[in-house]
């Protein structure tokens, strides 16, 4: 997590700053949403537990051609210790449940804000 520089600052940033920046990006997405986010694309729901950053990325990486979430995808990759590619699935996916990207982002945002408030940055 010390290698998360480059999104909003030139050098490495503390984990709390990286998480705050991710939250702020998700807030931007939800607030600037005019038409359905990513044309209403559906993604696998995930369990918001340990390892959820990789799981979130694995879900969102399957959405292509949606510029609104490209920065989020890049930021999530900084929190995930392994390389994630399209079609990859983790046990954290709720494989029988698909939700719209907009709802996925909303749920993720709510959870990340609580992690930030509780001081859980990893």
């Amino acid at each position: 997590l010390t290698c998360l520089g480059g999104f909003a600052s030139p050098g490495p940033v503390p984990p709390s700053t990286a998480l705050r920046e991710l939250i702020e990006e998700l807030v931007n997405i939800t607030q600037n949403q005019k038409a359905p986010l990513c044309n209403g694309s559906m993604v696998w729901s995930i369990n918001l537990t340990a390892g959820m950053y990789c799981a979130a990325l694995e879900s969102l990486i399957n959405v292509s051609g949606c510029s609104a979430i490209e920065k989020t995808q890049r930021m999530l990759s900084g929190f995930c210790p392994h390389k994630v590619s399209a079609g990859q699935f983790s046990s954290l996916h709720v494989r029988d449940t698909k939700i719209e990207v907009a709802q996925f982002v909303k749920d993720l945002l709510l959870h990340l804000k609580k992690l930030f408030r509780e001081g859980q940055f990893n």
Epitope: K113, K114, F116
Partner: antibody, heavy 120, light 112 residues
Amino acid sequence: EVQLQQSGAELVKPGASVKLSCTGSGFNIKDTYIHWVKQRPEQGLEWIGRIDPANDNIKYDPKFQGKATITADTSSNTAYLQLNSLTSEDTAVYYCARSEENWYDFFDYWGQGTTLTVSS
Amino acid sequence: DVLMTQTPLSLPVSLGDQASISCRSSQSIVHSNGNTYLEWYLQKPGQSPKLLIYKVSNRFSGVPDRFSGSGSGTDFTLKISRVEAEDLGVYYCFQGSHIPYTFGGGTKLEIK
């Protein structure tokens, strides 16, 4: 309009238990934290604990551990405070409050308080 | 636990005077996320507490600008520049940085 509506006053006997409720309207309790605060007659405020209704993550002040149990029912948008083995020390006004919904920085709305009297 | 110590216990003032309430924490209340969750609440008789100041110095919406908060680390102050009758009541500082969260003992602002 955001509101927290608490249950009515209670008069209970020593040794009994009581369950107080706090129902949110105008917001979803899953989107925030609900806290409980105690105020004994003519005394200050004491934080009892809080619940994250989205995942039932609960934190207590250790001095209320065993005395207080905080729960939530998201289907009715209600948080509860159960107090057991009541003594005169538990006679107080109990408030619920919510953390504001942006960054959970502070308590922006409070319930009106529930007066609990423990007396034989 | 973080002990929050408020002084004075009682503060007699004349209307129009400045009032100052001090709150000292037994340890730093800077949260691991960098924020300092220090709040000030006012409780009037028979009412629920109401938020005045959050994160040390931010006025809550609708709070008059005669209220100001300052401080850092372990020392915090609430100032009321010109006390009005509606300001009377008990003021509490509160730290929401370290669980268990804790309130100060309260300061009663009353007419001299």
